[in-house]
């Protein structure tokens, strides 16, 4: 029996992957439940098994095809159905028509990599992952660098307001650890948000030279 | 404060297909979630669908079964609901709702939730 409050949250990553959470007050963490993806103007239809997050949520990737495969456009509408076993019958739990480019939540940024560093810079660049070619320059990043002694969470966050794979972190300390963060975001769509952080990218900027001021 | 009026009812064959309409005036119209109601004869107003301010999500009540289909156009102030294969059952009057507060279309929203009325316009299924 499943019954209480419910949330259905869908996002795209602009590519062939339609990431899913369902969240259902009351529900019994054993209940078989399924994503179905019926696009309204293709000839495939995908579905993928809820598998428990949390004590109410659960989680499933669509995957509709190669991972660098154009699957959907910005004219495509998805209906998304939430399923879920009771007895010898599914159950429909939830319809939501999906407009994936108005969803967008692109892949981490991969391949960091530390281009050159010195005392008290370091320029890093990065990679997007799996991001349509239909953004072309639409995109912005944010960047955070994590201090000795701090948090992530207390990290000042860095913008880039444009699509740039690189940035020159400046006035670091001589002879220190760091690390860095960065996550990428389309500006288009209505609720479109922030890719997850990349992988941490640890550096150690160069000790200052004997005898000169730091 | 926005007005609602909707259009498009009438008398329908069972199997037929309506194309409800409801036309916004006197306020910013993308500022608004919309719904569709509706309520049958002796029965409670039941959600029929809502989607965002922008159309990004819509969410059905799953007694709808994929026959109805709910869309807006911003630029036109009007949002649509399209109801494919009528039922007698789908009689009932159709009433279009505005919503001022925030809603991300990931859950059933309660009829409460909607703070703007239009007048209804009544649909008959006849088998």
């Known amino acids: 029996a499943v019954n209480g409050t419910s949330q259905f949250t869908c996002f795209y990553n602009s590519r062939a992957n339609i990431s899913c959470v369902w969240s259902q007050d009351g529900a019994l963490q054993d209940t078989s439940c399924q994503v179905h993806a019926w696009p309204d103007r293709r000839r495939w239809n995908q579905t993928c098994e809820l598998l428990p997050v949390s004590q109410a949520s659960w989680a499933c990737n669509l995957i509709l095809g190669a991972p660098d495969s154009q699957k959907l456009t910005t004219v495509d509408i998805v209906t998304l159905r939430v399923l879920c076993r009771e007895g010898v019958r599914w159950r429909v739990m939830a319809i939501q028509d999906f407009k994936p480019f108005e969803n967008l939540r692109l892949m981490a940024p991969i391949s960091l990599q530390v281009v050159h560093v010195e005392t008290h810079r370091c320029n890093i660049s990065w990679e997007i992952s799996q991001a349509s070619h239909y953004f072309e320059r639409h995109l912005e990043f944010e960047a955070r660098t994590l201090s000795p002694g701090h948090t992530w969470e207390e990290a000042p966050l860095l913008t880039l307001k444009q699509k740039q794979e690189w940035i020159c972190l400046e006035t670091l300390t001589p002879d220190t650890q760091y690390e860095f963060q960065v996550r990428v975001k389309p500006l288009q769509g209505e609720f479109t948000t922030w890719s997850p952080w990349s992988q941490p990218l640890a550096f150690r900027t160069k000790p200052a030279a004997l005898g000169k001021d730091t | 404060q926005l007005q609602l009026v909707e259009s498009g009812g009438g008398l329908v064959q069972a199997g037929g297909s309506l194309a409800l309409s409801c036309a916004a005036s006197?306020?910013?119209?993308?500022?608004?979630?919309m719904g569709w109601f509706r309520q049958a004869p002796g029965k409670e107003r039941e959600f029929v669908a809502a989607?965002?301010?922008?159309?990004?999500?819509?969410m059905y009540a799953v007694s709808t079964e994929g026959r109805f289909s709910c869309s807006r156009d911003n630029a036109k102030n009007t949002v649509y609901l399209l109801i494919k294969n009528l039922k007698p059952e789908d009689t009932a009057v159709y009433y279009c709702?505005?919503?001022?507060?925030?809603?991300?279309?990931?859950?059933?929203?309660?009829?409460?939730?909607?703070?703007?009325w239009g007048q209804g316009t009544q649909v008959t299924v006849s088998s």
């Open positions: 709702a505005a919503r001022t507060s925030y809603y991300d279309g990931t859950y059933y929203p309660a009829s409460s939730d909607f703070d703007i």
């Open positions: 989607t965002t301010r922008g159309g990004g999500r819509t």
């Open positions: 006197g306020g910013t119209f993308s500022s608004y979630a």
